[in-house]
Amino acid sequence: CEEPPTFEAMELIGKPKPYYEIGERVDYKCKKGYFYIPPLATHTICDRNHTWLPVSDDACYRETCPYIRDPLNGQAVPANGTYEFGYQMHFICNEGYYLIGEEILYCELKGSVAIWSGKPPICEKVLCTPPPKIKNGKHTFSEVEVFEYLDAVTYSCDPAPGPDPFSLIGESTIYCGDNSVWSRAAPECKVVKCRFPVVENGKQISGFGKKFYYKATVMFECDKGFYLDGSDTIVCDSNSTWDPPVPKCLKVLPPSSTKPPALSHSVSTSSTTKSPASSASGPRPTYKPPVSNYPGYPKPEEGILDSLD
């Protein structure tokens, strides 16, 4: 027979030879880190077919690391379900607890003994320090010094000293989350007031209000003969600007003829009295007026804007 077979868990006793005679026996022993459990044979014989009789290393078992119990308020999860050396132990904590120590331990061979690579971790209760204080506002449970997992606080704004109230920008409620970190940044309290939205040749149709504070929503429509350039719905955002910007009402142009009509600031002639109502100023040469970009205010329009109510 040629050289005897090799195995992961056991090794040949003595030096291998290039050739073996029929009937010759070779013996194996369990490798370092493995131990023998009878009764399976750990030898083989060269038979008359010039092949080795079947043998396996199933009798050699990996050394195992000591049993690790679940940490309090957590779990020890053996990778591949085994404690044998070369494998890992994963540690996870129950919800509301966090890990102190190594998340993974390795079963390692020290000499012929399998031992864990470190000390098992522990699971500590998630605790948060008090949430941030905010200017012009406060939160519930302000007297509490330590918060547990999922404890929530709700912010509210103080009464404003002036005529306009403070608006709460952001989520009012935050909770103590994983890693002892609050679920999100604290909101802020500030006066948010958008300017009165003026739309020339149009008007507001909903969302009427004395003043327009944070998240106020307004809708517009244009007068007959005008069309909406922009969104018909705008919302007062946290920067005290309308988002999207206040729309414009532009004059519906007549069907185009061969020669386009000249833009003019003169009064259009018709049976009903119409007069220009654009943001252009004064009797000037025909031109496109400069467009202002102040948020929340009507901008100059092209051409004559008839004032039709």
């Epitope: 040749n201 943001s279 102040y294 205010y297």
Partner: antibody, heavy 118, light 107 residues
Framework: EVQLVESGGGLVQPGGSLRLSCAAS????????ISWIRQSPSRGLEWLGV???????NYNSAFMSRFTISRDDSKNTAYLQMNSLKTEDTAVYYC????????????WGQGTLVTVSS | AIQLTQSPSSLSASVGDRVTITCRAS??????LNWYLQKPGQSPQLLIY???SLHSGVPDRFSGSGSGTDFTLKISRVEAEDVGVYYC?????????FGQGTKVEIK
Amino acid sequence: EVQLVESGGGLVQPGGSLRLSCAASGGSVSSYDISWIRQSPSRGLEWLGVIWTDGGTNYNSAFMSRFTISRDDSKNTAYLQMNSLKTEDTAVYYCERVYDGYPWFAYWGQGTLVTVSS
Amino acid sequence: AIQLTQSPSSLSASVGDRVTITCRASQGIANYLNWYLQKPGQSPQLLIYYTSSLHSGVPDRFSGSGSGTDFTLKISRVEAEDVGVYYCQQYIKLPWTFGQGTKVEIK
């Protein structure tokens, strides 16, 4: 608190022109939206137009072809340029600070009288 | 333009009387209506904005109500200093317009 003072009124012939000034003290004219309003016994109170903080303007269409509102930030003054004046333009003219971006007129000056007569 | 019609055009009241002035709009203006008082020889002064909100410094004997097209200014107990011309003003739509005025005199 900003104070607005109108000036430039007087007697002018029909067809003539006049420029009224609105000087701001105690604040910057460019920080406020300024409206011009006039008052006459025959026509009552009439809103003429507004110049917004960004320099954009809106007008009462009845006056737009003849009246122009402007502003000179270096002089801290707003203006109402009136052309092709008619006898019915005789009135007291007020410049008015629009109340905090809302069309409420809470800051009336004393006004300036414009008389259009031959 | 939106027309505002005030009634009555004038009225005479005794000190302590309750006075009511109405303002009717030619089309709906929601609550976008202000009231002004022009005392003799003075410029107008803002009394009420957004139909019913009292401007700072205005006595609480003044009150406003209404919505849409019909609005009312009430003086619960008129005083001698309340004489003058009262104006309403709309601001839902350009051009912003005023009523023709209601003159209040004291008997």
